[in-house]
């Protein structure tokens, strides 16, 4: 079926036609692109009442739609396989001419997210209420209909033409008939703009009889952004009527001469333009003419006029509108540029800061300086970024490897570091030996002692710790534990077999190898070298012959 | 057949008000201005109103402000509302076709005023 | 107001003669836009209503028999009949329809002998 009752309204720099007719939404947008359009844009609350007058007026032609309810294809449309997008306005739909994503929207109820099948977008207007401009026709989404089973499809469309102008509609100064033929092929009678590239066919006089006038004229660009008939005087004039019949046809003052013929004239302020009717300011700014924020600058005598813009913005090629001038294609930043309306700004990258000499100039961010440090120790600037060190007995640690973790030395894959006991501290480690044994000058040996009940040669004192300042871990000097059997560390050390061939006495102290090299305050990582437990002499039956050291936090000997 | 039949007639008293019809048949009623000319006992044609096609309303000045004409175009009926009658506004009122020219008139309705 | 003035007010002639009446109105009826005069000649027979005969001062109306000619322009109008006959017995008018308020002539009596 095709599409029967039209409607349309023109407006601004575009008409929209309604049509009434059970088409599916690919037949009518196949409609409107036949006669150069699209199916409708709703892109603002103007829009969406321009389209609420067409709907209207074809409402008021179209008598047999009897339905409470009545829906119009409008070109929203959302692909098959393209899912619903809640945060944006147009919920991932877009509109069939292309466009941007604009921020009106007249959602009827919330959407279901539905990814499978090509979805559309129609008015719903609810026939039982008056349309109002309060109560624009809500959007609703479905599916789009099938060509050829009218039963699939709604009753009806809105298409949408554009046009680079517009003529104003031809005044009658007598009785007479204009019929308008838009480029779309709407005939209409009534338009308050006429689309570029129009013709209008004007019968003058009253009546049926063959006495009727015919003149045709064109709607036609006469300069940049000026559209009109090329008509001149008022048409259809009647002695009868004189200036009585639509003040003759004149935009403000009517004359009569004494033939009967009359003339229009201009207030003070105003003169007439080419076409003998239409008045203009005497000062062409008065009109206008500028847009886009352009303000309107007289010329020598008040005679023409050039269109000014606001710092930023430059004149489009119409030189009426001002557009965004993009400053950022002469590279006026560092590093980034953004381009702002009617401006820019300047951004520095990740590490920098704004400064430095010029403007839009970047410096380096020091990140290690005093206060800002994100280092858990040691902290190097390098330019535009930084990097975490730690001390001797630490490795870096934590997902953005700003944090130091305490090596234990007593564990791991490089060997036995002690021959005997191994006790790990914050940053360091010492050796021990069990009860009758001494630790050997080495610090790493036992030797046979004088025999003794007492503990093993346990940690330092506090202050013999070795330990590193500036560290976050725990001070804690544990021997090298065993996990128990809910994960929590046992405070047993870690025994390796004594060397018998020292005659060191019993000492317990710090083991300060692997010494930092390098300017002081600076520390190297220190290659990892964990010691294994090495098994060491007999134990005495029963195996718990381990005995716990204490630590000096007061825990049990957990790190 | 262009027709044009007036209705509506008959003696009213002074400053009393009336009426008048015309029905009109065989062309395009709305294409056409339409006028009221009434004929004097003495024979002398006068002219009373007009409507443009465009609904605008033309009076002399004998009858401006008591006159009214007023059509219906989907009933194809011309009227003429009259108020504030007077001895002088007896006559035959005669409903006309006035396209480009006058060119089809009714057969007219008798209006008179007497106490 | 355009008044229009008809002469004479009444005459009689023979069957077959020729008759002229005379109209003048007080400005010009002549449309300089599209050199058009706009009057009207009227025939209203007794017992009935005007019927018109000429438009635009010198064109005769369909059905009017051709004995019935309009002439004139501007201010000064005629309206002639070649031969008269039985049943052109009526009362003639003029009328402009150049400008609202319309205007009639005051008649013309046509009687036969």
């Known amino acids: 079926t095709g599409a029967d009752t039209e409607a349309v309204v023109c407006v601004g720099t575009a008409c929209y036609t309604a049509h009434s007719g059970k088409l599916s939404a690919a037949e009518a947008q196949n409609h409107c692109n036949q006669n150069g359009g699209n199916l409708a844009t709703v892109k603002s609350k103007e829009e969406a009442q321009h389209v609420q007058r067409v709907l209207a007026q074809l409402l008021r032609r179209e008598a047999a739609l009897t339905a409470r309810m009545s829906k119009f294809w409008i070109g929203l449309q959302r692909e098959k396989g393209k899912c619903l997008d809640p945060s944006l306005p147009l919920k991932g739909f877009s509109w069939v001419g292309g466009g941007e994503d604009t921020p009106y929207s007249n959602w009827h109820k919330e959407l279901r997210n539905s990814c499978i099948s090509k979805r559309c977008v129609s008015l719903l207007l609810d026939l039982s209420q008056p349309l109002l401009p309060s109560r624009l026709p809500k959007w609703s989404e479905g599916p789009c209909g099938s060509p050829g089973s009218p039963g699939s499809n709604i009753e009806g469309f809105v298409c949408k033409f554009s046009f680079k102008g517009m003529c104003r509609p031809l005044a009658l100064g007598g009785p007479g008939q204009v019929t308008y033929t838009t480029p779309f092929q709407t005939t209409s009678s009534s338009l308050e703009a006429v689309p570029f590239a129009s013709a209008a066919n004007v019968a003058c006089g009253e009546g049926d009889k063959d006495e009727t006038q015919s003149h045709y004229f064109l709607c036609k660009e006469k300069a940049p952004d000026v559209f009109d008939w090329g008509s001149s005087g008022p048409l259809c004039v009647s002695p009868k009527y004189g200036c009585n019949f639509n003040n003759g046809g004149c935009h403000q003052d009517c004359f009569e001469g004494g033939d009967g013929s009359f003339l229009c004239g201009c207030r003070p302020g105003f003169r007439l333009l080419d076409d003998l009717v239409t008045c203009a300011s005497r000062n062409p700014c008065s009109s206008s003419p500028c847009r886009g924020g352009a303000t309107c600058v007289l010329g020598p005598h008040g005679k023409n006029y050039t269109c000014r813009c606001p710092q930023g913005y430059q004149l489009d090629s119409s030189q009426l509108d001002c557009v965004d001038v993009d400053e950022c294609q002469d590279s006026p930043c560092a590093q980034e540029c953004v381009n702002t309306p009617g401006g820019f700004r300047c951004e520095c990258w990740v590490g920098y800061e704004p400064g430095g000499p010029g403007e839009g100039a970047c410096q380096d961010v020091d990140e290690c300086a005093l206060g800002r440090s994100p280092c858990a120790q040691g902290c190097t600037n390098t330019d535009g970024s930084f990097h975490c060190s730690c001390e001797e007995g630490y490795v870096l640690a934590g997902e953005d490897g700003t944090q130091c973790q305490d090596v234990d030395e007593c564990v791991g894959p490089g060997g036995p570091l002690c021959d005997s006991l191994c006790f790990n501290t914050q940053g360091s480690f010492h050796c021990g030996c069990l009860p009758g044994w001494v630790l050997a000058p080495n610090g790493v040996s036992c030797t046979m002692g004088p025999v003794s009940l007492g503990p093993p040669s346990g940690p330092p004192d506090e202050e013999d710790k070795g330990e590193k300042e500036g560290s976050t871990v725990p001070r804690a000097a544990t021997a090298s534990p065993t996990r128990g059997p809910e994960g929590t560390p046992k405070a047993t050390p870690t025994t390796s077999r004594p060397s018998l061939s020292s005659d060191a006495p019993i000492t317990s102290a710090p083991l300060k190898m692997l010494a930092p090299s390098g300017s002081p305050g600076v520390w190297r990582e220190p290659s990892i070298h964990h010691a294994t437990a090495a098994s060491g002499p007999q134990e005495p039956a029963g195996g718990d012959s381990s005995v716990a050291t204490q630590n000096n936090d007061g825990t049990d000997g957990q790190k | 057949e262009v027709q044009l039949q007036e209705s509506g007639g008959g003696l009213v008293k002074p400053g009393g008000s009336l009426k008048l019809s015309c029905a009109a048949s065989g062309f395009t009623f709305s294409r056409y201005a339409m006028s009221w000319v009434r004929q004097t006992p003495e024979k002398r044609l006068e002219w009373v109103a007009s409507?443009?096609?465009?609904?605008?309303?033309y009076y002399p000045d004998s009858v401006k402000g008591r006159f009214t004409i007023s059509r219906d175009n989907a009933r194809n009926i011309l009227y003429l509302q009259m108020s504030s009658l007077r001895s002088e506004d007896s006559a035959m009122y005669y409903c006309?076709?006035?396209?480009?020219?006058?060119?089809?008139w009714g057969q007219g309705t008798t209006l008179t005023v007497s106490s | 107001d355009i008044v229009m003035s008809q002469s004479p007010s009444s005459l009689a002639v023979s069957v077959g003669e020729k008759v002229t009446v005379s109209c003048k109105s007080s400005?010009?009826?002549?449309?300089?836009?599209?050199?058009?005069?706009?009057l009207a000649w009227y025939q209203q027979k007794p017992g009935q209503s005007p019927k018109l005969l000429i438009y635009w001062a010198s064109t005769r109306e369909s059905g009017v028999p051709d004995r019935f000619t309009g002439s004139g322009s501007g201010t000064d109008f005629t309206l002639t009949v070649s031969s008269v006959k039985a049943e052109d017995l009526a009362v003639y008018y003029c009328q402009q329809y150049y400008r609202y308020p319309y205007t009639f002539g005051g008649g013309t009596k046509l009687e036969i002998k």
């Open positions: 006309v076709r006035d396209g480009n020219y006058p060119d089809y």
């Open positions: 400005q010009s009826l002549l449309y300089s836009s599209n050199q058009k005069n706009y």
């Open positions: 409507i443009s096609s465009g609904g605008g309303t």
